[in-house]
């Protein structure tokens, strides 16, 4: 797998690897159009979760506001569906016992925003 | 910072830390078998980038198909805007020289999908 050494090399001691300090592109920032969460036809709110033993400590989850989508009159149109757009992301967990600190990667499912879709006829019609 | 040991502890040798093997929730998956990218009123396409020295090796970027949004008649309505939804995510870079393998975190900006918004009137007045 990705984290294993080549077969011809001695195995990693204690099931851990070397993680270099410093993050490439650490200061890179999202520059989204402003207030898209409230201007969208499938608007959303944000919920922030905070964990001091996770990097990044702050993870933001979007929550669609409506079942349907907002039409030109500003009313909810239930013939269309607001749906979440999700993304798998990696975070780093910090585990410490005294001065012994180790880190582990964790996969987190983040809802980034919402989009308006034409419905597929499921059970809800 | 997050990756530093407490001040009372001896510094990390060689500017690296211990990364435990294995990923928490590794098998967690986005349930995107829903074709929302083509059913959206702000549809998008995907481009896949592949890098064997990155985890995950595959990073998917979305590109909005239209400037405007698709109306009920399936036509582009230029009075509304399709805009990208972006998310910062972490990936892991693998660096190796012979049997010496180390890893480093990297921030990557991913466009996850698109949403349809009411335009903000800017410079066009």
């Amino acid at each position: 797998t990705f984290f294993q050494k080549p077969e011809s090399c001695p195995p990693v001691p204690g099931g851990s690897m070397k993680l270099d300090i410093g993050i490439i592109n650490e200061n890179q920032r999202v520059s989204m159009s402003r207030n898209i969460e409230s201007r969208s036809t499938s608007p959303w709110d944000y919920t922030v979760t905070w964990d001091p033993n996770r990097y990044p400590s702050e993870v933001v989850q979007a929550q669609c506001r409506n079942l349907g989508c907002i039409n030109a009159q500003g009313k909810e149109d239930i013939s269309m569906n607001s749906v979440p757009i999700q993304q798998e992301t990696l975070v780093v967990r910090r585990k410490h016992q005294g001065c012994s600190v180790s880190f582990q990667l964790e996969k987190v499912l983040v809802t980034v925003g919402c989009t308006c879709v034409t419905p597929v006829i499921h059970h809800v019609q | 910072t997050f990756f530093q040991k407490p001040e009372s502890c001896p510094p990390v040798p060689g500017g690296s830390m211990k990364l435990d093997i294995g990923i928490i929730n590794e098998n967690q998956r986005v349930s995107m078998s829903r074709n929302i990218e083509s059913r959206s009123t702000s549809p998008w396409d995907y481009t896949v980038t592949w890098d064997p020295n990155r985890y995950p090796s595959e990073v998917v970027q979305a590109q909005c198909r239209n400037l405007g949004c698709i109306n009920a008649q399936g036509k582009e309505d230029i009075s509304m805007n399709s805009v990208p939804i972006q998310q910062e995510t972490l990936v892991v870079r693998r660096k190796h020289q012979g049997c010496s393998v180390s890893f480093q975190l990297e921030k990557v900006l991913v466009t996850v999908g698109c949403t349809c918004v009411t335009p903000v009137i800017h410079h066009v007045q």
Partner: nanobody, 123 residues
Framework: QVQLVESGGGLVQAGGSLRLSCAAS????????MGWFRQAPGKEREFVAA????????KYTDSVKDRFTMSRDYAKKQVYLEMNSLKPEDTAVYYC????????????????WGQGTQVTVSS
Amino acid sequence: QVQLVESGGGLVQAGGSLRLSCAASGLTGSSYAMGWFRQAPGKEREFVAAISWISGGTKYTDSVKDRFTMSRDYAKKQVYLEMNSLKPEDTAVYYCNDMPYGLDTRMDEYVYWGQGTQVTVSS
């Protein structure tokens, strides 16, 4: 793991009313909609109603429109189903569940259901 506890079912005469409650715990930060579903003997489970946690907007299946009203208490993470003018064909076990994709959620995506609450309408 989402935990769901439904209550409020019972035996009622046609034309009567019941109020079902559902307590949900373990919801993710992105959970935005809840639904009521029902399963009559020998039939498949079907959608009854849905509500948005934030806006309170609702959607109903045609057969219960104007008779059932779904509401929610966002702070308590509870949803309710007010059932009026009940008919014998409303007899079923009623379940609530998170709708992670709102109205786009498919029945086959559900892994976990609560125990449900039995509603029996006699004629």
